[in-house]
Interface confidence: medium
């Protein structure tokens, strides 16, 4: 590297490189210093100055050391559908990115371009895949024994309480409902248990049935119901 | 805008080698210097080896014989091979690259070496 007493400008040897933040200038074919972050060349250098460089205008930045002419625009405003994560300063852009329940569709090299509302996933159908902050929610339909009753971006399909004594039985997008006071919750063949995402819905809760009089005999109905009749997942 | 991810950092006893690569997502030709600096903790950034775009090397005094740069534009790599670790070569090494059509520095996310025993 250059002797480190050299000032700038100064003439590199042939075929060498400049210090550390110094730049070549090809027109003057000598080591300049590069401006800091924050900054834009105001002047060029020439053989006998360095380079005068000058604070960034409001709404532009530089983020890294340089010799351009003029400062980059900051990006334009977030949009309603997006939270500003980071704000534009003299040396960051701004960065918009989604905000909680949409997901970014298209994305730039920091933060999104666009964003989109993560799917909800309709009475019937429950979360296979939950949404992240670059990919949507992904639906199936409940399996038998399981149900979802809620539209939802974050609800999975959670199994039918198993009564011992069937009121209604349940199918994909109801539980069933039992006439009996202690109902058990499955763990029914198919039920496909995600981790649950922090969600605000209420649990969902069955009310306590009136004491029944029958029989205490216990038996249990088929708990498959025939699957969806439409088969999209909804949005 | 071309990005830069080296690689190749990690554990090394004194004495050891470490070679580390720095992939460009784009084309490297056009970058008149290229080249590799270190910062360990509260220290000054300090440029470690520079290479110019015909591939003249050069190096500081203190890793000149035991560190070599090299680039290769078609494959959009620059390396940095490290001989005779010491001690005091722990930092964060960072490549850099001088993009002319940008008129900007380019850098980086950097690489730890730590030479321990």
């Known amino acids: 590297l250059p002797a480190q007493v050299a000032f700038t400008p100064y003439a590199p040897e042939p075929g060498s490189t400049c210090r550390l933040r110094e730049y070549y200038d090809q027109t003057a074919q000598m080591c300049c210093s590069k401006c800091s972050p924050g900054q834009h060349a105001k002047v060029f250098c020439t053989k006998t100055s360095d380079t005068v460089c000058d604070s960034c205008e409001d709404s532009t930045y530089t983020q890294l050391w340089n010799w351009v002419p003029e400062c980059l625009s900051c990006g334009s405003r977030c949009s309603s559908d997006q939270v500003e994560t980071q704000a534009c300063t003299r040396e960051q852009n701004r960065i918009c990115t989604c905000r909680p329940g949409w997901y970014c569709a298209l994305s730039k090299q920091e933060g999104c371009r666009l964003c989109a509302p993560l799917r909800k996933c309709r009475p019937g159908f429950g979360v296979a895949r939950p949404g992240t902050e670059t990919s949507d929610v992904v639906c199936k339909p409940c399996a038998p024994g399981t149900f979802s009753n809620t539209t939802s971006s974050t609800d999975i399909c959670r199994p039918h309480q198993i009564c011992n004594v069937v009121a209604i039985p349940g199918n994909a997008s109801m539980d069933a409902v039992c006439t009996s006071t202690s109902p058990t919750r499955s763990m029914a063949p198919g039920a496909v248990h995600l981790p649950q995402p922090v969600s605000t819905r209420s649990q969902h809760t069955q009310p306590t049935p009136e004491p029944s009089t029958a029989p205490s005999t216990s038996f249990l109905l088929p708990m498959g119901p025939s699957p969806p009749a439409e088969g999209s997942t909804g949005d | 805008q071309v990005q830069l991810v080296e690689s190749g950092g990690g554990l090394v006893q004194p004495g050891g080698s470490l070679r580390l690569s720095c992939a460009a997502s784009g084309s490297i030709s056009d970058f008149y210097a290229m080249g590799w600096y270190r910062q360990a903790p509260g220290n000054q950034r300090e440029l470690v080896a520079a290479?110019?775009?015909?591939?003249?090397?050069n190096y500081a005094d203190s890793v000149k014989g035991r560190f070599t740069i090299s680039r290769d534009n078609a494959k959009n790599t620059l390396w940095l091979q490290m001989n005779s670790l010491k001690p005091e070569d722990t930092a964060v090494y960072y490549c850099?690259?001088?993009?002319?059509?940008?008129?900007?520095?380019?850098r980086g996310q950097g690489a730890l070496v730590t030479v321990s025993s």
């Open positions: 850099y690259a001088d993009d002319y059509s940008a008129g900007f520095e380019l």
């Open positions: 290479i110019s775009s015909s591939g003249k090397p």
